[in-house]
C-alpha cells in the first residue's frame, strides 16, 4: 500500500507560531509500542501455496537496520499434490514503509525519514486474461 | 516481519560527543525516496486464492495519516471452482511498520516514532496439525 | 483451562432478532477461530459458520446466510451471533465453539465448546 | 454438501460388549471427525484426524475408516460410555456433521 506525499504540512508549526529553524524538527527518543508483535508463525512461507524466500538486508545507519524482503519461490502456484500449477500466479504482496536514517558528521548527527517497499510475502492469484483482437 | 528493538545506541551520538540534549534528536524534513510507489498487479484483493478487503484507519496527527489493513475475506481458500476450500485457510501476512505520532502543546511540537502492525494481505495454506495431548 | 461461557436463554417473538455471546477464556483470542453450531431439539448439529478475529475471515453455510450475523470483540475476548427475521424454525440451542488457528491447526477443526444458548420463537 | 449418514440410528449394548458405528461419506473425505454428545449437554471431542483419541478420552476407543467409509469402535463397553456420538467432516465446504448414533445400556 502507498504511504502518500507529505507536501509541507505536517511536519510545520501551525501558521501562528514561529517556523522551525533550519529545516530540521525535535524527534522524541524511544518508541511508542515497541514490545507489539507479528503473531505470524509456522513457517507459513513455506506452507503458503505460492511460497517465499526471504532475504535479509543490512544497514547499520538505518533503523531498523535488518529490512527483510520476500521473493515468490515459482511463479505457478502449488498445488495439493505439492506441484505447480503453472495456470494461477504467484504474486508479491508489496507495502511501503518508513524507516530511519541516521546522518553524521562528526559529533553533528541528524535523522531523516526514507520510504522503503518491502515485499511481505505472496499470495496465489488467477491471472486476468487479455484476449487481444 | 518483525522490527527489532531499538535499545539506546541508534539515536545516540557516539560516546566521545555530548549527550542529545533533553531526550530529543534532530529530524530533517523531508522524505528519502518520497516518489517510490508500489507496483502490485490489479486487483490481487479480490483475485487471489485467498482474497481480501481493505479498511482505512485516518489520525491526522499520525505519518502516514491513512493505514491501510488488510483482513482476509473467507476462513478457507477458493478454488478453482470459486468455492471455498475449508481444507486450506486464509491467514493474513502481517508486517510491522514505523509511522511518526505528532504531539503538540501550543506552538511547542515534537514528533515521535511508532511502531504499528499492518496486515498486508492473505495467503492460502496447509495447515501443520500438530495436536497437543 | 479454555472456557467458553455463553450468555443466557432467550424467549422472543416472531420477526424480532436476537444477539447471543460467547466469552472466552484460558487461551489467546484473537489466535483461534469460533465457529457457532445450530441443534434443534436434541436432533442433528448444523454449522452455521466461522469467524477468526486476527485474520478477519469469516466462512457461512450457505443455509444461514441473511440469518446469522457472527462478529468479534477482542477488547472483552467475546464472540457473537445475531440472528434475525426470527421463526419457529429457529427455536434451538446454540453452541459456539472454538476451532482452529489457522497456521498449526486447521480453523474448521473444532475442539472445546460452550454450555448452549437456548432460543424459543413463539408469540 | 457432503452427508455423512451415520448408522445405526439407535443401538444397545451391554456392558463389556464390543460396540461398532459406522459413518458413511456421500463424497471421499480425508479424514472423519466424532463428538460425544450426553443428554442435556453439549458436545465434546472426541475422535479426531480419524483415529486419533481427544484428551481424556479412555483408550477402548478407537476409530478407523478412509474415503467414504469410517467408524467408532469401543472394545468393552461401559456405562459411561452410553450418549450420542457424532460424526463430522470438514474436508468440503460446509463443514457437516451426522445425524448421531444414540448408543443405550441395557
Known amino acids: 500500500r502507498k504511504i502518500p506525499k507529505v507536501g509541507h504540512t505536517f511536519f510545520q508549526k501551525p501558521e501562528s507560531c514561529p517556523p522551525v529553524p533550519g529545516g530540521s524538527m525535535k524527534l522524541d527518543i524511544g518508541i511508542i509500542n515497541e514490545n507489539q508483535r507479528v503473531s505470524m508463525s509456522a513457517n507459513i512461507e513455506s506452507r503458503s501455496t505460492s511460497p517465499w524466500n526471504y532475504t535479509v538486508t543490512w544497514d547499520p545507519n538505518r533503523y531498523p537496520s535488518e529490512v527483510v524482503q520476500a521473493q515468490c519461490r515459482n511463479l505457478g502456484c502449488i498445488n495439493a499434490q505439492g506441484k505447480e500449477d503453472i495456470s494461477m500466479n504467484s504474486v508479491p504482496i508489496q507495502q511501503e514503509t518508513l524507516v530511519v536514517r541516521r546522518k553524521h558528521q562528526g559529533c553533528s548527527v541528524s535523522f531523516q525519514l526514507e520510504k522503503v517497499l518491502v515485499t511481505v510475502g505472496c499470495t496465489c492469484v488467477t491471472p486476468v486474461i487479455h484476449h487481444v483482437q | 516481519r518483525k522490527i527489532p528493538k531499538v535499545g539506546h545506541t541508534f539515536f545516540q551520538k557516539p560516546e566521545s560527543c555530548p549527550p542529545v540534549p533533553g531526550g530529543s534528536m534532530k529530524l530533517d524534513i523531508g522524505i528519502i525516496n518520497e516518489n517510490q510507489r508500489v507496483s502490485m498487479s490489479a486487483n490481487i484483493e479480490s483475485r487471489s486464492t485467498s482474497p481480501w478487503n481493505y479498511t482505512v484507519t485516518w489520525d491526522p496527527n499520525r505519518y502516514p495519516s491513512e493505514v491501510v489493513q488488510a483482513q482476509c475475506r473467507n476462513l478457507g481458500c477458493i478454488n478453482a471452482q470459486g468455492k471455498e476450500d475449508i481444507s486450506m485457510n486464509s491467514v493474513p501476512i502481517q508486517q510491522e511498520t514505523l509511522v511518526v505520532r505528532r504531539k503538540h502543546q501550543g506552538c511547542s511540537v515534537s514528533f515521535q516514532l511508532e511502531k504499528v502492525l499492518v496486515t498486508v494481505g492473505c495467503t492460502c495454506v496447509t495447515p501443520v496439525i500438530h495436536h497437543v495431548q | 483451562e479454555v472456557q467458553l461461557q455463553q450468555s443466557g436463554p432467550e424467549l422472543v417473538k416472531p420477526g424480532a432478532s436476537v444477539k447471543i455471546s460467547c466469552k472466552t477464556s484460558?487461551?489467546?483470542?484473537?489466535?483461534?477461530?469460533m465457529h457457532w453450531v445450530k441443534q434443534s431439539h436434541g436432533k442433528r448439529l448444523e454449522w452455521i459458520g466461522g469467524?477468526?478475529?486476527?485474520?478477519?475471515?469469516?466462512s457461512y453455510n450457505q443455509n444461514f446466510k441473511g440469518k446469522a450475523t457472527l462478529t468479534v470483540d477482542k477488547s472483552s475476548s467475546t464472540a457473537s451471533m445475531e440472528l434475525r427475521s426470527l421463526t419457529s424454525e429457529d427455536s434451538a440451542v446454540f453452541y459456539c465453539?472454538?476451532?482452529?488457528?489457522?497456521?498449526?491447526?486447521?480453523?474448521?477443526?473444532?475442539?472445546?465448546w460452550g454450555q448452549g444458548t437456548s432460543v424459543t420463537v413463539s408469540s | 454438501q457432503i452427508v455423512l449418514t451415520q448408522s445405526p440410528a439407535i443401538m444397545s449394548a451391554s456392558p463389556g460388549e464390543k460396540v461398532t458405528m459406522s459413518c458413511s461419506a456421500s463424497?471421499?473425505?480425508?479424514?472423519m471427525h466424532w463428538f460425544q454428545q450426553k443428554s442435556g449437554t453439549s458436545p465434546k471431542r472426541w475422535i479426531y484426524?480419524?483415529?486419533k483419541l481427544a484428551s481424556g478420552v479412555p483408550a477402548r476407543f478407537s476409530g478407523s475408516g478412509s474415503g467414504t467409509s469410517y467408524s467408532l469402535t469401543i472394545t468393552d463397553m461401559e456405562a459411561e460410555d452410553a450418549a450420542t456420538y457424532y460424526c463430522?467432516?470438514?474436508?468440503?465446504?460446509?463443514?457437516?456433521f451426522g445425524a448421531g448414533t444414540k448408543l443405550e445400556l441395557i
Open positions: 465453539a472454538r476451532g482452529g488457528d489457522g497456521y498449526y491447526t486447521n480453523y474448521f477443526d473444532i475442539d472445546y
Open positions: 484460558g487461551y489467546t483470542f484473537n489466535e483461534y477461530t
Open positions: 469467524i477468526n478475529p486476527n485474520s478477519g475471515g469469516v
Open positions: 463424497s471421499s473425505v480425508n479424514y
Open positions: 484426524d480419524t483415529s
Open positions: 463430522q467432516q470438514w474436508n468440503s465446504h460446509p463443514l457437516t
